[in-house]
């Protein structure tokens, strides 16, 4: 069952013996009550009681899953890839029915020669992984194949793969224009029909750290953002320190609520702190204002 708990003012004692005042807010927090056996525990925000403690769902933590984490793990893939579907026409080999059978000696030999030829063609492309023949058909031999590209994930991976696909197009166009039959004979490893070269389709890995961050932040999606460090994306709230978007709470503690990040100001033995960033100090004895 869901219960509605009003959030009231609480005082937290800081490490220096000071207290943190949390003002009353007009939002209500839904509470899920999970019951396992005789043990009844209020695990909030979709968390569940495992018999010992609350198991919290992202982005929550704490004894009752009532607090919001400052950062969420997002894991971009180690590598990203692109697959290009190409067709070339090989004229230096005549088509036979055995080429349709991928376990035949004919297909294996053709595959070996074609792979060798393409490895030479694409040798200067660092993203090039290899080729995979998907189909062979009559005319002399029409080779439907995939060119596989891969690169390390960086924020600019799409540009890197897009550039690589362009170089693939240039190189295959060049080789199929230059390596052609003369007098019904081929002096190259393979010869081609220039007009038979086509790029059918290009598929690039889709990974968006911002989207993953927003999804994992759930109802806090508007307040979590992605920042990069050493080309690695971090999904952070403004309460996470050390980033451009970090909120400076000065004499206070940053806390996430459903309205965003806010500062909970400290009250020490000598001062009250207030203001949005807890940067306004009032001396208790003289009621003197500091900015």
């Amino acid at each position: 069952p869901l219960a509605t708990i009003p959030v009231s003012t609480t005082s937290l004692t800081s490490s220096e013996g000071s207290t943190i005042s949390t003002p009353s807010v007009d939002i209500s927090t839904p509470v899920t009550t999970s019951i396992v056996g005789d043990q009844c525990s209020r695990c909030k925000n979709g968390g569940f009681w495992d018999g010992l403690k609350c198991q919290c769902l992202t982005p929550y933590y704490g004894e009752s899953c009532e607090e919001v984490v400052n950062s969420i793990d997002i894991a971009p893939p180690e590598t990203v890839s692109a697959q290009m579907e190409l067709t070339v026409t090989v004229t230096s080999v005549k088509f036979t029915d055995e080429l349709k059978n991928h376990s035949s000696q004919e297909f294996r030999e053709f595959n070996k020669t074609f792979t060798e030829q393409m490895n030479i063609v694409y040798s200067g492309i660092p993203e090039y992984v290899g080729v995979n023949i998907t189909n062979l058909r009559l005319g002399s031999v029409v080779v439907e194949h995939d060119v596989l590209l891969r690169t390390k994930y960086t924020p600019e991976y799409k540009t890197a793969l897009d550039n690589a696909t362009e170089v693939v197009k240039q190189k295959i166009t060049k080789v199929t224009t230059e390596q052609i039959m003369t007098n019904d004979n081929c002096s190259a490893l393979m010869c081609f029909n220039t007009t038979g070269t086509q790029v059918q389709n290009i598929t690039v890995t889709q990974y968006d750290p911002v989207e993953e961050c927003r999804q994992k932040a759930e109802e806090y999606e508007d307040y979590f953002l992605v920042e990069y460090r050493d080309q690695k994306p971090y999904c952070i709230s403004p309460c996470e320190s050390g980033f451009n978007a970090s909120k400076n709470c000065n004499h206070g503690k940053c806390q996430m609520s459903q309205n965003g990040a806010r500062c909970l100001c400290v009250t020490t033995e000598t001062h009250w702190y207030s203001g949005e960033d807890c940067n306004q100090g009032t001396q208790k004895s003289h009621h003197h204002h500091h900015h």
Partner: nanobody, 123 residues
């Protein structure tokens, strides 16, 4: 495993003739292609002649009209009849085979090779 064994090489005078033979271990190439290549000392291996299962034959320009390639599928054998031999024909002659119906005189396009037989044309 496929094996190719050449024979028929030797010493011959300029203008003379020789017939090279290549015996294949089985008839797997009867539906593909067979060829002769040669390699002169200090030079790259070059294509001499091809014969394919569809009846097509191809020759290097340097041997056209002088050399003839033929095949006997019943005997799993390939032949090269060499007439009007010249000093520049001196080389090790290799038999090569492919399961593919090839039109390529590039040695890299061929996957199966014999050990070679030496042909020396000298007076």
């Amino acid at each position: 495993d496929v094996q190719l064994v050449e024979s028929g090489g030797g010493l011959v005078q300029p203008g003379g003739s020789l017939r090279l033979s290549c015996a294949a271990s089985d008839n797997t190439f009867s539906r593909g292609s067979m060829s002769w290549f040669r390699q002169a000392p200090g030079k790259e291996r070059e294509g001499v002649a091809i014969i394919s299962s569809d009846g097509w034959t191809g020759y290097a320009d340097s041997v056209k009209g002088r050399f003839t390639i033929s095949q006997d599928n019943a005997k799993n054998s390939l032949y090269l009849q060499m007439n009007s031999l010249r000093a520049e024909d001196t080389a090790v002659y290799y038999c090569a085979a492919s399961f593919l119906v090839l039109r390529a005189l590039n040695p890299k396009a061929w996957h199966y090779w014999g050990q070679g037989t030496m042909v020396t044309v000298s007076s």
